[in-house]
Amino acid sequence: QEDEDGDYEELVLALRSEEDGLAEAPEHGTTATFHRCAKDPWRLPGTYVVVLKEETHLSQSERTARRLQAQAARRGYLTKILHVFHGLLPGFLVKMSGDLLELALKLPHVDYIEEDSSVFAQSIPWNLERITPPRYRADEYQPPDGGSLVEVYLLDTSIQSDHREIEGRVMVTDFENVPEEDGTRFHRQASKCDSHGTHLAGVVSGRDAGVAKGASMRSLRVLNCQGKGTVSGTLIGLEFIRKSQLVQPVGPLVVLLPLAGGYSRVLNAACQRLARAGVVLVTAAGNFRDDACLYSPASAPEVITVGATNAQDQPVTLGTLGTNFGRCVDLFAPGEDIIGASSDCSTCFVSQSGTSQAAAHVAGIAAMMLSAEPELTLAELRQRLIHFSAKDVINEAWFPEDQRVLTPNLVAALPPSTHGAGWQLFCRTVWSAHSGPTRMATAVARCAPDEELLSCSSFSRSGKRRGERMEAQGGKLVCRAHNAFGGEGVYAIARCCLLPQANCSVHTAPPAEASMGTRVHCHQQGHVLTGCSSHWEVEDLGTHKPPVLRPRGQPNQCVGHREASIHASCCHAPGLECKVKEHGIPAPQEQVTVACEEGWTLTGCSALPGTSHVLGAYAVDNTCVVRSRDVSTTGSTSEGAVTAVAICCRSRHLAQASQELQ
């Protein structure tokens, strides 16, 4: 999940020098940018979120808003400041003519401006059938801990909080920020207004059909009776949660956002801030049978984004559309014909479908995990959700071909025990956005702030790439992949792990002159090899060179093609041990895999040799996958020989710490 992607319209309005009487001009060379939703029908022109630079104080925000009003008035325009943001993002919400955008972009402290846009509930349809009573025996599901230490915030429609399923479990806050319903003849029927929110509250914490039966909830109304809201209303809701958290700090917080709109820089930024304040955000991937990266908050990297599967673990089809997919989805969860509280009556049940229902399942699982281990960080929780998921059960044929490799084949599940996973070395795979096809294009994959980048690989469908390297960016390692001339673009693939007290560094060897190939090892005492990367400047990496094989007995070393620079990720962490596992196939093969055995975690995945017919390498759960070009296009047998190299690690320190706890 990347912040800077999405089929997103960015209009940079250059600053003009004739601005009248600006006391403080913007910093030299900076240009504030204007953003709007790429989906035209969802745009709400006339209302704008003006986002100010990070360090801007509330008083400066208010002053900037007043200044905009004054300058607009001098031009004969009326403006209305609807809200001044502080607590999450500095800025303000203003109702004004689009003619004033150029003026607003020149104001001091302005970082960017985003036109408001719509967000929508992600359940379709809203009343398939009435089900009374629920279709299962309550005995079947008695969780050990019902999430009683956790508060779940629900940003949704109004809800029927006295429904028998959820009475006493949901506190309806006084927060309400919703647009008017569309259509002059719209009839506000209470039960329909409450439908979406009531159902989701029931899925999260319902007495009989809920996941986390002990969780208490707080609801904020950001969606109207038609299930429609705005980015600005959602932002103000997230700010309300942050302020509540500051006024009255409680235990762990989970925020459920069962809604989606077009890609929104400001909504993603607000989610990032809230996540960094220790809040777990769970959102619907969206019901558009599309790349989730094109929607918000689904595309926010800090948010846990959930796609929907059915009882057969297949992606959910919703009419002509269905669940979203792609690299911005973290995992899938049940989202078809989900039984929950119906607002039609106080004892009614209904089944609803969608990524909203899937997200509610994951919010419930998260509440239970956090109740059992309240100190879990967002990164730890995400890694556990991934670790305990059912793997490789989704039929990927449902997804577009180019999205299959990017979409996680994971269906959320409750851990067998809510305790005792501490010994595990947890890792996950993070794909970058596509680089684009230009010669010098690169793609960057990043880990979360409290994860370690243990290895970096790259993948190109055309095979035209120039490898990858780990490099420092803002004090953290990132994984950068390089496109090659004539290539259609590359992906960078980061292996992101939870490794407490780790000290990792990258050791690089430049291309070797000798024919033996390039090699680099971890020479520091106590450092172990966790990943290998190779990067080359030449367009075609010696197609007819013989393959380079790793010398036996040198597990702490990366080897590669003599024309490539080789990068070794070397880490020191208490009790960390790693080993190299290889699987070579002499005959041409489109895919070669090697897996780490039980108790070991895959940290590194690379290919030998790094020749141009290798499309790339990537980790899928605990398996290293190396993909090659279609064998029919491969020349000689020797050229077709590929070895998948996995680096498998475990932490004796984590295992011991876990045993001491038990």
Partner: antibody
Framework: QIQLVQSGAEVKKPGASVKVSCKAS????????ISWVRQAPGQGLEWMGW????????NYAQKVQGRVTMTTDTSTSTVYMELRSLRSDDTAVYFC????????WGQGTTVTVSS | QSALTQPASVSGSPGQSITISCTGT?????????VSWYQQHPGKPPKLMIY???NRPSGISNRFSGSKSGNTASLTISGLQAEDEADYFC?????????FGGGTKLAVL
């Protein structure tokens, strides 16, 4: 603290109606409805129905359906239970209780139906 | 005729444990997590002792515990005390309403 305070005892003739009130306080009213339960002398408990403070929706037990009406007055946080066409077997103590979970109870209102 | 069946009476000596059963069907006790137990002293309103099968409200002694197996719920009182002498009622959700048991008179000998 959370309280449900009911109106005083009533003596009614057969065929008449009775209206018992229950004033709620100390909690968020819209998070719970109010259940009505009655107990005939020396007998067990019988659930009569439920009303929502949130939207006024009701759910009546089949046995009293057609004779009972539950209403709310949100301005005074009060719920009313009216039972019509009283018979001698309606003689009972009538309780209001919070929600379907019935975790808090009123003190009870004795209704005597006698000619 | 109550929908849920309870023994009319049980007895025990101080310090002993007793169990009261509450039998229903798959449409009530067996189908829902929402079985409650109430204690009622003469002339007083009922008092919630156990909710959602096995949860105790705050302030209720841990001598009171609840469980459920299939269509039968149980209330166990350990370390019987004189003040436990009262009537005990179980209740359960049904699809659209609530049902009570006929009540069990507990005598502490």
């Amino acid at each position: 603290q959370i309280q449900l305070v009911q109106s005083g005892a009533e003596v009614k003739k057969p065929g008449a109606s009775v209206k018992v009130s229950c004033k709620a306080s100390g909690y968020t009213l819209t998070s719970y409805g109010i259940s009505w339960v009655r107990q005939a002398p020396g007998q067990g408990l019988e659930w009569m129905g439920w009303i929502s403070f949130y939207n006024g929706n009701t759910n009546y037990a089949q046995k009293v359906q057609g004779r009972v009406t539950m209403t709310t007055d949100t301005s005074t946080s009060t719920v009313y239970m009216e039972l019509r066409s009283l018979r001698s077997d309606d003689t009972a103590v009538y309780f209001c209780a919070r929600g379907y979970g019935m975790d808090v109870w009123g003190q009870g209102t004795t209704v005597t139906v006698s000619s | 005729q109550s929908a849920l069946t309870q023994p009319a009476s049980v007895s025990g000596s101080p310090g002993q444990s007793i169990t009261i059963s509450c039998t229903g069907t798959s449409s009530d006790v067996g189908g829902y997590n929402s079985v409650s137990w109430y204690q009622q002293h003469p002339g007083k309103p009922p008092k919630l002792m156990i909710y959602e099968v096995s949860n105790r409200p705050s302030g209720i002694s841990n001598r009171f515990s609840g469980s459920k197996s299939g269509n039968t719920a149980s209330l166990t009182i350990s370390g019987l005390q004189a003040e436990d002498e009262a009537d005990y009622f179980c209740s359960s959700y049904t699809s659209t309403s609530m049902v009570f048991g006929g009540g069990t008179k507990l005598a502490v000998l």
